[in-house]
């Protein structure tokens, strides 16, 4: 048993039929010694008396909020949550496996630049009685500070008959140098509590590996005289690290017809302009990627040819 | 410790082309190592990230763009002295700091070159003959060092008499390639910045 936060405890249980469970001793936080009684979840049934209560925790029925009272007055509470271990593996019932980039990916993270700011998100099909708390650090043995905000519900989607809820959190490394060469990964730890069930999820990464620039901005077309060609120009996204001559991007320019089956013309360039042939009803799209370290491409920025 | 924004003479920067070749070569070599050594811990997640130049050179700090010198997190400077002549420094306007930066890059390349050559000698003794260092990568390191053209003592190749542990050598190769790729990215960024300055 360990303390998750004040008055909230996690009991780790091997979860199999007829498992013996864990013996837990609860102590009433009071100087009082006599006349103390214990109840569970504000039920009126008295479970025991005395300053300590010994319980055998085997299943969710044994978890909950234990309260000690004296003469009708509440003295203190202890909330017991369960963390299940089945066949040696901690349960992952609360979050959905996103399966990208590999199986058992519950947390996904992205950064728009090298400033040390990043966003992580996760999915669940649970909509109520759910709380998350997020901690992060650079390295684990001698951790350096990373500050994370509160996790918030960022999207709701319908997937077939099921509703899916996306939660996200923003974190910022306390003292980040954009030019630094990372040798210790960022660790992100999410505590998830659904009713009386506790689970934890972790992710470990280097900022350089989760970079995904915003799409190029100010995408414009300039027709070239007496030609079907156009000059496409764009700018670095505002969120990208500066100076741009040091944090350089490379770009992919794509001409796409109205039909998805039509052949796509693609050009790769390090410049912020390109000359392409604009077909009728086609659109021109540009996306960006770090020029020197091949992490993710940005989403496309698009303009119609007409 | 920073790079001032100088206005170099046109065509001053032959090093940019070489640094791009270097990044391409080390990335290809790393990819080849990951594929060939698929049953060894050779991915970024599996290896320990070691920097053989740590406390010997200070490339990131010495080559910091001027715009980042206001960022206190970037200024944990380590004083290192370097020899300051070289053919990438075609302009007399080039500052001492830029020379310091480029000589730090040169020292990095020299250290990695020695390590890679020592390692290749061991890998050539492996009866499995599973993996060797790409000669192109070694050549590209050499070309960039020549372009930087710093006078420096040659470091003798480390030789060991004992029978090499080939498993450990291959793990070390992965560690070295990952670290060198990261340094090659920094070198490329620096060259691009200097070229634009």
């Amino acid at each position: 048993i360990w303390e998750l936060k004040k008055d909230v405890y996690v009991v780790e249980l091997d979860w199999y039929p007829d498992a013996p469970g864990e013996m837990v001793v609860l102590t009433c936080d009071t100087p009082e010694e006599d006349g103390i009684t214990w109840t569970l979840d504000q039920s009126s049934e008295v479970l025991g008396s005395g300053k300590t209560l010994t319980i055998q925790v085997k299943e969710f029925g044994d978890a909950g909020q234990y309260t000690c009272h004296k003469g009708g007055e509440v003295l203190s509470h202890s909330l017991l949550l369960l963390h299940k271990k089945e066949d040696g593996i901690w349960s992952t019932d609360i979050l959905k496996d996103q399966k990208e980039p590999k199986n058992k990916t519950f947390l996904r993270c992205e950064a728009k630049n090298y400033s040390g700011r990043f966003t992580c998100w996760w999915l669940t099909t649970i909509s109520t009685d759910l709380t998350f708390s997020v901690k992060s650090s650079r390295g684990s043995s001698d951790p350096q500070g990373v500050t994370c905000g509160a996790a918030t519900l960022s999207a709701e989607r319908v997937r077939g008959d099921n509703k899916e809820y996306e939660y996200s959190v923003e974190c910022q490394e306390d003292s980040a140098c954009p030019a630094a060469e990372e040798s210790l990964p960022i660790e992100v730890m999410v505590d998830a509590v659904h009713k009386l069930k506790y689970e934890n999820y972790t992710s470990s990464f280097f900022i350089r590996d989760i970079i995904k620039p915003d799409p190029p901005k100010n995408l414009q077309l300039k027709p070239l005289k007496n030609s079907r060609q156009v000059e496409v120009s764009w700018e670095y996204p505002d969120t990208w690290s500066t100076p741009h001559s040091y944090f350089s991007l490379t770009f992919c320019v794509q001409v796409q017809g109205k039909s998805k089956r039509e052949k796509k013309d693609r050009v790769f360039t390090d410049k912020t302009s390109a000359t392409v042939i604009c077909r009728k009803n086609a659109s021109i799209s540009v996306r960006a990627q770090d020029r020197y370290y091949s992490s993710s491409w940005s989403e496309w920025a698009s303009v119609p040819c007409s | 410790r920073n790079l001032p924004v100088a206005t170099p003479d046109p065509g001053m920067f032959p090093c940019l082309h070489h640094s791009q070749n270097l990044l391409r070569a080390v990335s290809n070599m790393l990819q080849k190592a990951r594929q060939t050594l698929e049953f060894y811990p050779c991915t970024s997640e599996e290896i320990d990230h070691e920097d053989i130049t740590k406390d010997k050179t200070s490339t990131v700090e010495a080559c910091l763009p001027l715009e980042l010198t206001k960022n206190e997190s970037c200024l944990n400077s380590r004083e290192t002295s370097f020899i300051t002549n070289g053919s990438c420094l075609a302009s007399r306007k080039t500052s001492f700091m830029m020379a310091l930066c480029l000589s730090s890059i040169y020292e990095d390349l020299k250290m990695y070159q020695v390590e890679f050559k020592t390692m290749n000698a061991k890998l050539l003794m492996d009866p499995k003959r599973q993996i060797f260092l790409d000669q192109n990568m070694l050549a590209v390191i050499d070309e960039l060092m020549q372009a930087l053209n710093f006078n420096s003592e040659t470091v003798p190749q480390k030789s060991s008499l004992e029978e090499p542990d080939f498993y450990k050598t291959k793990i070390k190769l992965c560690i070295l390639l990952h670290a060198f790729r990261i340094r090659a990215v920094t070198i490329d960024r620096v060259m691009s910045y200097l070229n634009a300055s």
Epitope: D41, Q42, S43, S44, E59, F60, G61, G64, Q65, H77, L79, D93, T125, I126, S127, T128, D129, D161, N162, K163, K195, L196 | -
Partner: antibody, heavy 119, light 107 residues
Framework: EVTLRESGPALVKPTQTLTLTCTFS??????????VSWIRQPPGKALEWLAH???????YYNPSLKSRLTISKDTSKNQVVLTMTNMDPVDTATYYC???????????WGQGTTVTVSS | EIVMTQSPATLSVSPGERATLSCKAS??????VAWYQQKPGQAPRLLIY???NRYTGIPARFSGSGSGTEFTLTISSLQSEDFAVYYC?????????FGGGTKVEIK
């Protein structure tokens, strides 16, 4: 001892607003494991959950009725109030309030109040 | 919303016999299912929570099982006071939903 009691009009006219009050004792809505739900049951039919309010004022509604429902609490009076606008004869039912603890099941129920919607 | 389907609608059983009531969820609800008993003119009464946990004061003849989408309430030996309507309910997701009920009557 935990008790809940529903009160409100027995008869409302169509289009009117229904206001129901749940007065409870034996537990507190300021505690971090408690909430109160409203459930209804038309004559001879199944139970239908309407709305829930948590100790921290977080509220959930049945989407099919959300635009017509408002749930609120007065912790000092130990009361939870449900208002339902634009009443219709199909809303004729027994309305229950129930306590929902951290175990998430509704462990204590009021005796119910019957509301008839008729002109 | 998650639909809870109970079967059978009516179950005729003799006192002392075993009664097995079924409840199916339209999607996985983990183990977030409760069972209630309701007698005519009375409010529902909680029997089982978290699919298999007997609530305080509920006799041992009542047991619940299942997880995911299929749940069962078993009354091992029916007593005269057990003849009533039984509802399952999920609160895995909002809106919390009840099944249509199973009426257990005397055969």
């Amino acid at each position: 001892e935990v008790t809940l009691r529903e009160s409100g009009p027995a008869l409302v006219k169509p289009t009117q607003t229904l206001t129901l009050t749940c007065t409870f004792s034996g537990f507190s809505l300021s505690k971090s494991v408690m909430g109160v739900s409203w459930i209804r049951q038309p004559p001879g039919k199944a139970l239908e959950w309407l709305a829930h309010i948590y100790w921290d004022d977080d509220k959930y509604y049945n989407p099919s009725l959300k635009s017509r429902l408002t749930i609120s609490k007065d912790t000092s009076k130990n009361q939870v109030v449900l208002t339902m606008t634009n009443m219709d004869p199909v809303d004729t039912a027994t309305y229950y309030c129930a306590r929902r603890g951290i175990r998430s099941a509704m462990d204590y129920w009021g005796q119910g109040t019957t509301v008839t919607v008729s002109s | 919303e998650i639909v809870m389907t109970q079967s059978p609608a009516t179950l005729s059983v003799s006192p002392g016999e075993r009664a097995t009531l079924s409840c199916k969820a339209s999607q996985s609800v983990s183990n977030d299912v409760a069972w209630y008993q309701q007698k005519p003119g009375q409010a529902p009464r909680l029997l089982i929570y978290y699919a298999s946990n007997r609530y305080t004061g509920i006799p041992a003849r009542f047991s619940g099982s299942g997880s995911g989408t299929e749940f069962t309430l078993t009354i091992s030996s029916l007593q005269s006071e057990d003849f009533a309507v039984y509802y399952c309910q999920q609160d895995y997701n909002s809106p919390w939903t009840f099944g249509g009920g199973t009426k257990v009557e005397i055969k």
